[in-house]
Every structure is written in structure tokens, then in C-alpha cells.
Interface confidence: medium
Amino acid sequence: MMTGTIETTGNISAEKGGSIILQCHLSSTTAQVTQVNWEQQDQLLAICNADLGWHISPSFKDRVAPGPGLGLTLQSLTVNDTGEYFCIYHTYPDGTYTGRIFLEVLESSVAEHGARFQIP
């Protein structure tokens, strides 16, 4: 039975040209995290594998930095980066948990951040 839950940074906004941290946290389960995939729609951004480390997609490696933790830092943001991002936690024995983050990249110089939390 899958008992875990994914907490995410929720809906967030950031300034064009700036950077943002995409962060998810899996809680309420003792399942082992074997891999976390970060995807935008159906496109791979990055993978963090427990045994193999980080793999950044060719499409993003010039402006994606791994971390902090299992999170992902997007740099040099453009308006085209606006959209849904998914953290997909592969765990054993529970299976797959998915979290959703919506990022809005704003042209203006004032970008209000949405829900935020600290990852312990």
C-alpha cells in the first residue's frame, strides 16, 4: 500500500533571466527512493539515480543545475519555461509517486513566489 505523500513548492513564479529551485519532498513512507525524474510535460529535464547520480538531459544541461538535494535549479529562465513540471519518485517497494509544480516566468521585474517551504 502506498502511504507516502509528495510535498512540492506548488505554484511559483520567477523573473525572466533569473533562476528558480524546483523542489519536492516525499514523506510519510519508509520506501527507499531509487530514482527521481524531473520532467516538463513529457520532456526529460534530469534524473537523479541513487546509484548512478545525476543525468541532465541534453536539451537542458546548459542551464540546469542538479540540487539542492533531489531538487533541480533552472537558470537563465525564459517565458517559454512557463508550464508544469513533475517530480517522479521511483521507490521500492511502494512504486511511483508524482508531484506537480507550476512555474510562471514573468517579464516584469517583480515576481512573487507562491507557496514555499523548507526541505529539512
Epitope: 548512478l52 543525468h55 538531459s57 541534453p58 544541461k61
Partner: antibody, heavy 120, light 107 residues
Framework: QVQLVQSGAEVKKPGASVKVSCKAS????????IEWVRQAPGQGLEWIGE????????YYNENFKDRVTMTRDTSTSTVYMELSSLRSEDTAVYYC?????????????WGQGTLVTVSS | AIQMTQSPSSLSASVGDRVTITCRAS??????LNWYQQKPGKAPKLLIY???SLHSGVPSRFSGSGSGTDYTFTISSLQPEDIATYYC?????????FGQGTKVEIK
């Protein structure tokens, strides 16, 4: 030594599906993506997609997305590529190749190729 | 998708000649370029990765250079066993794409 051994030649009718296998040996199966590339007669190379055997994560060329499925069997270190709704222009040699998980992306070992002929 | 344009499509040179193949990307690919050799009826073989790094076991007569959108592959002294088709391959952005190939023949 590293080997990628592919299944034998196939002849299919238009509209049918084909499933090509690629059996890996001589290295740690989960540490490398398996790539699929095809080559029509007398033509160049076209990337179809990739799968990471450890997790089953797969990413496809948009040109094939609706017709291709990649799967793996970790117990036999085998990857499968299934292409559906075949048409005559899918006649090609289909290659699997491995790409190391990490930051440099290159296909350092290739299978021998599988000729798929689509003809009525 | 990034288009890779290779030139020439074919060439004929004498043993010992210096051979140069160029590959132009439709947008900057940041040195994320590989070169493969393919002989008739065989799978491609990796020669050069990341623009200029020689893959293990590949003879030093093969080399690569370039930046931005323009890349060059060189055989410093053509040998009979180099008869093959050569492909460039970009991995800057998915989908991975290849040049259309350059067929190298001996005069």
C-alpha cells in the same frame, strides 16, 4: 567484452507491428541508456529514442512518439523496441547502441543491426 | 529539431592525403558533437566525442575541432582502411540528430 546482440531480420506487412530485441552483456546493464537508431536503405542515421534499463524511463523522438514503445527485461539484460502501424518507409536497419548515464553523451557500442522490411 | 548539414556528401582522395569534412548545425550546439565512422553493412563506430576527444582505441590520425555552429573532422593521412561513410551527431538538444553523411573513397 561488451556486446549488444540484436534479434534477426523481420518482414512485415503495412499496418503491422514489429518488436526488435537487443541483449546486452559484458557491462553493468543499468548504468547505460539503450538508444535506438535506424537507417533506411542508402540513407543516414535517425534517432528513435532511448530507455534507461534500471528504471524503465524512456524518451522518444517526436516523429515516432505515437508508434514506438521501448521496454526492458532486467532479468535477461534485454531491451525491446516495438514499432506499430508500419509503413513502407519504415523499412530500415534498426540499431541499438549504449550511452553511458552521466554527462558525456555518445554511443560507444552498437548492436549488429536488425533489418526490418515492410512490404505488402 | 537541430539540422546538421555535412559537406561534402562524398569525396575521393589519395592514400596519405589530408581529408577534411565539415558539419554545420542550424543553431549553436556548444561543442556537443560526435563523429562516427560506418563501413558498408556494419554498425557505426564512435571516433570523436565532444568535438575533439578521441575515443579509446581510435588512431590519432583522426581529429575534430570547432565551436558554435561549425565543426570539422580531419583525417591527417588517409589510409585504405578509412574508406567509409562519416557522420556527425549533435547531442546539444533532443532529439539527437545526425548529419547526412560523407562518403570517403580512395582515388
Amino acid at each position: 567484452q561488451v556486446q549488444l546482440v540484436q534479434s534477426g531480420a523481420e518482414v512485415k506487412k503495412p499496418g503491422a507491428s514489429v518488436k526488435v530485441s537487443c541483449k546486452a552483456s559484458g557491462y553493468t546493464f543499468s548504468n547505460y541508456w539503450i538508444e535506438w537508431v535506424r537507417q533506411a536503405p542508402g540513407q543516414g542515421l535517425e534517432w528513435i529514442g532511448e530507455i534507461l534499463p534500471g528504471s524503465g524511463s524512456s524518451y522518444y523522438n517526436e516523429n515516432f512518439k505515437d508508434r514506438v514503445t521501448m521496454t526492458r527485461d532486467t532479468s535477461t539484460s534485454t531491451v525491446y523496441m516495438e514499432l506499430s502501424s508500419l509503413r513502407s518507409e519504415d523499412t530500415a536497419v534498426y540499431y541499438c547502441a549504449r550511452q553511458k548515464y552521466g554527462n558525456f553523451y555518445y554511443f560507444d557500442f552498437w548492436g549488429q543491426g536488425t533489418l526490418v522490411t515492410v512490404s505488402s | 529539431a537541430i539540422q546538421m548539414t555535412q559537406s561534402p556528401s562524398s569525396l575521393s582522395a589519395s592514400v596519405g592525403d589530408r581529408v577534411t569534412i565539415t558539419c554545420r548545425a542550424s543553431q549553436g550546439i556548444g561543442n556537443y558533437l560526435n563523429w562516427y565512422q560506418q563501413k558498408p553493412g556494419k554498425a557505426p563506430k564512435l571516433l570523436i566525442y565532444y568535438t575533439s576527444s578521441l575515443h579509446s582505441g581510435v588512431p590519432s590520425r583522426f581529429s575534430g575541432s570547432g565551436s558554435g555552429t561549425d565543426y570539422t573532422f580531419t583525417i591527417s593521412s588517409l589510409q585504405p582502411e578509412d574508406i567509409a561513410t562519416y557522420y556527425c551527431h549533435q547531442y546539444s538538444k533532443l532529439p539527437y540528430t545526425f548529419g547526412q553523411g560523407t562518403k570517403v573513397e580512395i582515388k
